[in-house]
C-alpha cells in the first residue's frame, strides 16, 4: 500500500470559448481508494478555487460552466490525488480558453453535381459554420476540411478548403455513389468531429477531369 502516483491533466477542450472541460489521467492508486480534486486560480489571483463541476465531463474531469469561464484570463490548475498513505500533485497546467476550442461539426452540408454546358462538370459542396461559434468578433478563424469517397471504397480523399464554406471537386468516378463529410477547426484549436455523411450519386455521363 502506497501513496497515489502522480496524476496528469492531459486534455482541455471548449466547444465555443464560453465553457470548457479538462480531463486528467490518474497515476497508480497505491492499492487504496483514492480521491481526486482539481484546484485552480486565474492569472493575477492568488486565491485558489476548487473545480466547480466534477460531473458534467464524466470521470476524472472538471467542467467550467459559463459563470466560471473567462477568455481574458489564463487558468492555472493542478490535480491532487489523496489516499490513506499520502498525496501527490500533477504538474501545474496553464490554460488559455482561446487555444482549446474544439467546435461542433459544420452544419447544413449540401452536395450537388453541376454540369455547365461550357465547362467540365464538378461536384459543388457547401456548408455552414457551427452555430455556437461566433465568427463576427473576428478573432475566430475557422478552417475546413472535406473528405469524400465512393460508397464501397476504403480510402478517403481529403481536401483542405481553408476558410471558405464552399468547394468544387472535379475528379470523380462516373456512376459512383459518394459519401461526403466536412469538419472544422480554429487556427489554434482542434478539429471538430466529421459532420454526418451526405450521399451523392455521380451521373454516368459525368466526364472525369484528367
Amino acid at each position: 500500500q502506497l501513496p497515489p502516483g502522480k496524476p496528469e491533466i492531459f486534455k482541455c477542450r471548449s466547444p465555443n470559448k464560453e465553457t470548457f472541460t479538462c480531463w486528467w489521467r490518474p497515476g497508480t492508486d497505491g492499492g487504496l481508494p483514492t480521491n481526486y480534486s482539481l484546484t485552480y486560480h486565474r492569472e493575477g489571483e492568488t486565491l485558489m478555487h476548487e473545480c466547480p463541476d466534477y460531473i458534467t465531463g464524466g470521470p476524472n474531469s472538471c467542467h467550467f460552466g459559463k459563470q466560471y469561464t473567462s477568455m481574458w484570463r489564463t487558468y492555472i490548475m493542478m490535480v491532487n490525488a489523496t489516499n490513506q498513505m499520502g498525496s501527490s500533485f500533477s504538474d501545474e497546467l496553464y490554460v488559455d480558453v482561446t487555444y482549446i476550442v474544439q467546435p461542433d461539426p459544420p452544419l447544413e452540408l449540401a452536395v450537388e453535381v453541376k454540369q455547365p454546358e461550357d465547362r467540365k462538370p464538378y461536384l459543388w459542396i457547401k456548408w455552414s459554420p457551427p452555430t455556437l461559434i461566433d465568427l463576427k468578433t473576428g478573432w475566430f478563424t475557422l478552417l475546413y476540411e472535406i473528405r469524400l469517397k465512393p460508397e464501397k471504397a476504403a480510402e478517403w480523399e481529403i481536401h483542405f478548403a481553408g476558410q471558405q464554406t464552399e468547394f468544387k471537386i472535379l475528379s470523380l468516378h462516373p456512376g459512383q455513389k459518394y459519401l461526403v463529410q466536412v469538419r472544422c477547426k480554429p487556427d489554434h484549436g482542434y478539429w471538430s468531429a466529421w459532420s454526418p455523411a451526405t450521399f451523392i450519386q455521380i451521373p454516368s455521363d459525368f466526364t472525369m477531369n484528367d
Epitope: 493575477g44 481574458w72 489564463t74 488559455d96 482561446t98 482542434y190 478539429w191
Partner: antibody, heavy 118, light 112 residues
Amino acid sequence: EVQLVQSGAEVKKPGSSVKVSCKASGYTFTSYWIHWVRQAPGQGLEWIGEIDPSDSYTNYNQKFKGRATLTVDKSSSTAYMELSSLRSEDTAVYYCGRSFFTNWFAYWGQGTLVTVSS
Amino acid sequence: DVVMTQTPLSLSVTPGQPASISCRSSQSLVHSNGNTYLHWYLQKPGQSPQLLIYKVSNRFSGVPDRFSGSGSGTDFTLKISRVEAEDVGVYFCSQSTHVPFTFGGGTKVEIK
C-alpha cells in the same frame, strides 16, 4: 518531469539538408504544440514554426515556408525540424519548445548547434 | 512581421539595485480576443531561454517576485526590483499575438 531532449550538433554543407529531433518525455506528447526557434551566433531568437502533434497541423513563419518541414512521430514522442537548401546564414542553435494550452512556451530543449560550412 | 525593439542593449547593475528593460512593438499586441500576448524570457549564459513573465505581467511558476512586467499596446517594461548575481544573462521580450511570433534583440544584464 517534463523534458525535451534534442539531437546532437551537426556540420552540413551549403545546399544540403539537416533534420533535428526533439524527444519529449514526462507528459502526454500529443497534448501540446511544439515550437521551433533558432538563434544565430550572438544574435536574437527567430521563430520557425509550430506543430500540433495530435494531428500534425502546422503554422510556419513565411520566411521558412518551403524550406522548413515540421513533423512528429507519435510512437516515439519525437518532433522533427528539417531545413533544406542550407546556407551559411542558417548556422545557429535550433531549439524546440513546448507550450501549455496557450500560445507561449515554457519548456525548451537544450538546443542543437547546426553549422553550415563548405 | 511585428518588430520588437528592446532598450538598452546592455545593462551593468550593482547587486541589490533595480534594473529596467524596455520593449516596444511595431504594432499593437492586443489580440482580437482582448488578451496581450507579450512575454519575457531570460537566457542565462550557456543555457536555453527560460520563461519569466507571460501576458505582460504574470510571473511564471517559480519566478521570484523581484521580477515584474507592465505595459500595454506597444510599450512594455520588465523590472527587476533588486538585481542578484543569478539574474545575469540576456533578456528577450517576445510576442505571440501575431504570426509569426517574434522576439526582441535582447538586453544583456551584467553585474558590476
